[in-house]
């Protein structure tokens, strides 16, 4: 089948990193500088992405694969493929239109990005607060008050800090 396809379409023999050059009797020519082809049989090479300014090059462009950008230090990527860069804040802060602001009481942010989120309400799970929350950390829920009464046979180990649901980037 491969041989039949090759007879029908000479371009199918051109490997990644080359293109089928119509101007040169359909021979396989290398991709020009700053371009690539990641699959065989391509009639053109794609322009490489350029990482400039707030973007920096995470992976250089090669003849067979595109460049990849990330953000310069102090910034983090937004969007698939890092299409935008947003300023980092400190843990215990969130980015607002007026810059990085501390989390309000009762909320926390344990990352350099994203928004402040409410502390876990331990009582909703019938538990008590074992460790108080801070701007940087969620509360740690412990055993329920009933479990701590005299004569209780066992103590439930503290539950790990619950990560509130957030959509992946």
């Amino acid at each position: 089948f491969e041989r039949t396809r090759s007879l029908q379409d000479p371009c199918s023999n051109c490997p990644a990193g080359t293109f089928c050059d119509n101007n040169r009797n359909q021979i396989c020519s290398p991709c020009p500088p700053n371009s690539f082809s990641s699959a065989g049989g391509q009639r053109t090479c794609d322009i490489c992405r350029q990482c400039k300014g707030v973007f920096r090059t995470r992976k250089e462009c090669s003849s067979t694969s595109n460049a990849e950008c990330d953000c310069t230090p102090g910034f983090h990527c937004l969007g698939a493929g890092c299409s935008m860069c947003e300023q980092d804040c400190k843990q215990g802060q969130e980015l607002t239109k007026k810059g990085c602001k501390d989390c309000c009481f009762g909320t926390f942010n344990d990352q350099k990005r994203g928004i402040c989120r409410p502390w876990t309400n331990c009582s909703l799970d019938g538990k008590s607060v074992l460790v108080n929350g801070t701007k940087e950390r969620d509360v740690v829920c412990g055993p329920s008050p009933a479990d701590l009464s005299p004569g209780a046979s066992s103590v439930t180990p503290p539950a790990p800090a619950r990560e509130p649901g957030h959509s992946p980037q």
Epitope: D46, I47, R49, K52, V54, L78, C85, Q87
Partner: antibody
């Protein structure tokens, strides 16, 4: 609050140099760069060039022989100089912060080239 | 340079209707396309970045899609304040370029 404001003479004579400044607040000039973009009356947007946070520049090849973008961190200002202007350079000129997608723009300033 | 071609040039619709704006790139630009809204006397306003990501504070009636060379901005239900000029722009390769714009007007 992030703010950018363009300023400069609204009227420039042909063959002279157009000089604009972009005064910024709410962010550091050593952290962010700035792009200059222009828009001819009733037309689309045209990227002129950019200065990056480290001070290096990139220019559109269409302007490269007559454009200079610079920064004065002590004044919180970026500047654009475009020499040998003609009537075709009449446009609204914008500066926009470099974040990868132009989320923050100045309000723009109209420059008319006429004798 | 990468050329972006927007269509239609003008779109006449009524409030409540759905608007579909197209942007075609002369080269593969991945998903590195943004959409902007511009009203008379104002600077462009970022709506969508990375082809499909709504920017902070943009209503969810605005959505973007596409990759490679074909991109679409959709406004699901037009509000009176949505009538404006819309531009696509590519941030993939320098020089950065923009489409010529689509004017969305009230029918």
């Amino acid at each position: 609050q992030v703010q950018l404001q363009e300023s400069g003479p609204g009227l420039v004579k042909p063959s002279q140099t157009l000089s604009l400044t972009c005064t910024v607040s709410g962010f550091s000039l050593t952290t962010y760069g700035v792009h200059w973009i222009r828009q001819h009356p009733g037309k689309g947007l045209e990227w002129i060039g950019a200065i990056w946070s480290g001070g290096s520049t990139d220019y559109n090849a269409a302007f490269i022989s007559r454009v200079t973008i610079s920064v004065d961190t002590s004044k919180n200002q970026f500047s654009l100089k475009l020499s040998s202007v003609t009537a075709a350079d009449t446009a609204v000129y914008y500066c926009a912060r470099d974040d990868g997608s132009f989320a923050n723009w100045g309000q723009g300033t109209l420059v008319t080239v006429s004798s | 340079e990468i050329v972006l071609t927007q269509s239609p040039g003008t779109l006449s619709l009524s409030p409540g209707e759905r608007a579909t704006l197209s942007c075609k790139a002369s080269e593969n630009v991945g998903t590195y396309v943004s959409w902007y809204q511009q009203k008379p006397g104002q600077a462009p306003r970022l709506l969508i970045y990375g082809a499909s990501n709504r920017y902070t504070g943009i209503p969810d009636r605005f959505s973007g899609s596409g990759s490679g060379t074909d991109f679409t901005l959709t406004i699901s239900r037009l509000e009176p304040e949505d009538f404006a000029v819309y531009y696509c722009g590519q941030t993939y390769s320098y020089p950065l370029t923009f489409g010529q714009g689509t004017r969305l007007e009230i029918k």
